[in-house]
């Protein structure tokens, strides 16, 4: 083993650590044990204990992240470096970071749960055996109603185990139908759809009817992901297996490696690759996010890397079921730490162990009727994503910019943005920022410098929003986000991280939209977000136009200031005032000489 | 003893290519990101670009990004810098250097180790 | 980018005197700065990293400290062989950034 120069350790045995965010590749559940277990084993052996919190103030800060995530040292894509750690110390020292780019399991594939069955919600075991050919995703074989199911164990013709898998046949998600299944065909705008669909919808999400009529009855749900078949790379990243599927003219109902020479697993994602050539790549066993989280947390208490291959702390990765440390990890853990004290000697217990009872007999094969229990679920959108940056304190003071006829507000044409922060009204433009505070004869007091107060930001921001209850300031400016509390700073975060799709270019803006709520708007499109949760409800997609009749379509801004709605396009604004649930246009008027009380000279 | 000897700098025409590279011993060279970083004569240091351990990933300062290819060959030891359409701007000394953190441990940072440099000259 | 700003641009003492260089950087960087001396037509070697470790081979006179946005190398008695330009560089965030320099001449 080896330690870092000078022995760096932690000077409490009682360890904090905090899980900042989610990767979507698993269940926060296990996610959530995936970690506990990992800490688990080093305290299993010192005596150390791991308790988890929910600040930054944690000593350990989990973070998933890729490419550049705030720190000095980007992440590469998928593969490679699979996850780093800072050794023992204050701030980001003793912090762990995993590579969201990986494909993230427990080390034997993706990790599916499944609901009914008789495996009682035990994850689907891939590959498994089933009527002696091996599947690597759920299939709907032995079936004649079409529900995709899985063996939990690595053999279902010897140990009958199984359970369904998330599918639209079996429950939807959110939506208005109590999460009832799909009805497929079903009739959307005049067309049948006898699949999910995105159609209608602007987010990407694939939902489905669940009565044969939506145009009629307007009842729907959302599809679950399928982990299982989502397939990567490829022509079709992101779209599912289809099963089975034709190629060569010969029926596949699992993924295949048949026409590849690297052994790769691939399946289409139409039912004919023959004739639409749609394919991608299987998903693969992933990584042990347990095994890489037990490695890096030897880094967070101060193990370098070991030169004995077996050892945890060796640099390769290793799947393995054994138990992960070996004597060598210990050594090195314990050269810090010391052993864990011996337990207090307890009196043997006289108590005679009772028989357990036996087994019940459960069914013998996938059930072919549909479970009369109706499925309940909750959403499986995108996990609310905490901040990926480390806090970065600026200096608070603000400095004062030599003054030039383009330095005073009123010579402003177009300000980059405008927020409400406090009780003033902040501008802000190409790196400065003015305030102002209505009142006779006011007159906006600046330019500063961003940079000053907020170092971490571009100079050119989208739009600028706070949010008066945790006093949290959001600043957008293109794909990305910073989150300032008082001087520190979280992100950049990429929007995806909100729940904003790919083809949100930037936020123009915010409103406040009820306790903890804000509306946020990129050009045309609106979206409720939950402040707390840091997300966006990808199903509250809705058109400004809709909800704000009479605004012009191509603001660039959108603000709150003293309980109105502002709307900006050009030097101009519509101001939006909110009567009995009737938003209205009051006022049209320029930013300048309306707003800042500029002499129109 | 740890080593770095670059070499390929020499006077090349604006527009023009070179080829640099930075042969290293007397450490586990596939363990480590490599750096390159440049002077210009008479001036401050300013990285170019990395490669990780395992050529997993590459990034580029802005000023050379599209123009510079950084690789390396870890069964020759051997690191590379690819430099097209080059600029009277690009003329400085490189260096290769080791960084001291090395894969998932990111405890230490600094360039623990570097080359004598190689000059590059774009002039016309 | 994070800017490195180092001070003075020169700084002017004799050998045995103590030197003290300073490195800003413009947002905190936690403990990831490193300080190089670069002597003419050398490469630069690296005297301490992640903020007040010498790195090996230094001598004891060397000395850093600082942390969160600002920095400083001590050199409590100089050596002739001291007299060099000096560099900080930093890798809280990315990309990495170095300071100007601050040469070090003799009185």
């Known amino acids: 083993f080896q330690t870092f120069e000078g022995d760096l350790k932690w000077h409490h045995h009682n360890i904090t650590y905090w899980i900042q965010n989610y990767s979507e590749d698993l269940p926060r559940a296990v996610i959530d044990d995936a970690f506990a277990r990992a800490f688990a084993l080093w305290s299993a052996v010192t005596p150390l204990t791991f308790t988890r919190v929910y600040s930054r103030d944690a000593d350990i800060v989990i973070q998933f992240g890729v490419a550049e995530h705030g720190d000095g040292y980007p992440f590469d894509g998928k593969d490679g470096l699979l996850a780093h750690a800072f050794p023992p110390g204050p701030g980001i020292q003793g912090d762990a970071h995993f590579d969201d780019d990986e494909l993230w399991s427990l080390g034997k594939g993706v990790v599916v749960p499944t609901r009914f069955g008789n495996a009682d919600g035990a994850a689907c075991h891939f590959p498994f055996i089933f009527e002696g050919r091996s599947y690597s995703a759920c299939t709907t074989d032995g079936r004649s109603d079409g529900l995709p199911w899985c063996s939990t164990t690595a053999n279902y013709d010897t140990d009958d185990r199984f359970g369904f898998c998330p599918s639209e046949r079996l429950y939807t998600q959110d939506g208005n139908a109590d999460g009832k299944p799909c009805q497929f065909p079903f009739i959307f705008q005049g067309q049948s759809y006898s699949a999910c669909t995105t159609d209608g919808r602007s987010d990407g999400y694939r939902w489905c009817a669940t009565t044969a009529n939506y145009d009629r009855d307007k009842l729907f749900g959302f599809c679950p992901t399928r982990a299982d078949s989502t397939v990567m790379g490829g022509n079709s990243a992101g779209e599912l297996c289809v099963f089975p599927f034709t190629f060569l003219g010969k029926e596949y109902s699992t993924c295949t490696s048949e026409g590849r020479g690297d052994g790769r697993l691939w399946c289409a994602t139409t039912s004919n690759f023959d004739s639409d050539k749609k394919w991608g790549f299987c998903p693969d066993q992933g990584y042990s996010l347990f095994l890489v989280a037990a490695h890096e947390f030897g880094h967070a208490l101060g193990l370098d890397h070991s030169s004995v291959p077996e050892a945890l702390m060796y640099p390769m990765y290793r799947f393995t079921e054994g138990p992960p440390l070996h004597k060598d990890d210990v050594n090195g853990i314990r050269h810090l730490y010391g052993p864990r004290p011996e337990p207090e000697p307890r009196p043997p217990t006289t108590t005679t162990p009772q028989p357990t009872a036996p087994p019940t007999v459960c069914p013998t094969g996938p059930p072919t009727v549909h479970p009369s229990e109706r499925p309940t679920a909750g959403p499986t959108g995108p996990p609310s994503a905490g901040p990926t940056g480390p806090p970065t304190a600026g200096p608070s003071t603000a400095t004062t910019v030599p003054l030039s006829p383009v330095d005073d507000a009123c010579n402003v044409n177009i300000f980059d943005a405008i927020a409400e922060i406090g009780n003033q009204l902040y501008l802000f433009k190409d790196g400065k920022y003015w305030r102002f505070s209505e009142g006779r004869g006011s007159r906006p007091q600046g330019p500063f410098l961003i940079a000053d107060k907020w170092p971490a930001l571009p100079r050119k921001l989208d739009s600028v929003f706070e949010e008066r209850l945790s006093k949290k300031l959001f600043f957008f400016s293109g794909r990305q986000v910073w989150v300032y509390t008082g001087a520190s700073v979280l992100g950049p975060r990429r929007l995806d991280k909100l729940g904003l799709g790919a083809d949100v270019a930037q936020v123009t803006g915010a409103l406040r939209s009820g306790r903890g709520k804000m509306l946020l708007f990129s050009g045309r499109r609106l979206w409720r977000f939950d402040v707390k949760a840091q997300m966006v409800d990808p199903r509250s997609a809705s058109e400004v136009d809709r909800m704000f009749p009479g605004v012009p379509l191509d603001t660039h801004d959108v603000f709150q200031y003293r309980e109105k709605a502002y709307f900006c396009q050009d030097r101009f604004y519509w101001r939006v005032s909110s009567r009995s649930e009737l938003n209205q246009v009051d006022q049209v008027g320029y930013v300048t000489y309306d707003i800042l009380q500029c002499p129109e000279d | 003893e740890v080593q770095l000897l670059e070499s390929g700098g020499g006077l090349v025409q604006p527009g023009g290519s070179l080829r640099l590279s930075c042969a290293a011993s007397?450490?586990?060279?596939?363990?480590?990101s490599m750096w390159w970083v440049r002077q210009a004569p008479g001036k401050g240091l300013e990285w170019v670009s990395?490669?990780?351990?395992?050529?997993?990933?590459?990034f580029y300062a802005d000023s050379v990004k599209g123009r510079f290819t950084i690789s390396r060959d870890n069964s020759k030891n051997t690191l590379y810098l690819q430099m097209n359409s080059l600029r009277a701007e690009d003329t400085a000394v490189y260096y290769c250097?080791?960084?001291?953190?090395?894969?998932?441990?990111?405890?230490?940072?600094?360039?623990?180790?570097w080359g004598q440099g190689t000059l590059v000259t774009v002039s016309s | 980018d994070i800017q490195m700003t180092q001070s003075p641009a020169t700084l002017s003492l004799s050998p045995g005197e103590r030197a003290t260089l300073s490195c800003r950087a413009s947002?905190?960087?936690?403990?990831?700065l490193a300080w190089y001396q670069q002597k003419p037509g050398q490469a630069p070697r690296l005297l301490i990293y992640?903020?007040?470790y010498r790195a090996t081979g230094i001598p004891a006179r060397f000395s850093g400290s600082g942390s969160g946005t600002d920095f400083t190398l001590t050199i409590s008695s100089l050596e002739p062989e001291d007299y060099a330009v000096y560099y900080c560089?930093?890798?809280?965030?990315?990309?990495?950034?170095f300071g100007q320099g601050t040469r070090l001449e003799i009185k």
């Open positions: 250097a080791k960084d001291r953190a090395y894969g998932d441990y990111v405890g230490w940072n600094g360039f623990d180790y």
């Open positions: 007397g450490f586990t060279f596939s363990q480590y």
């Open positions: 990395v490669i990780y351990s395992s050529g997993s990933a590459t």
């Open positions: 947002q905190s960087i936690s403990s990831f």
């Open positions: 992640d903020a007040s």
């Open positions: 560089q930093q890798r809280g965030n990315w990309p990495i950034t």
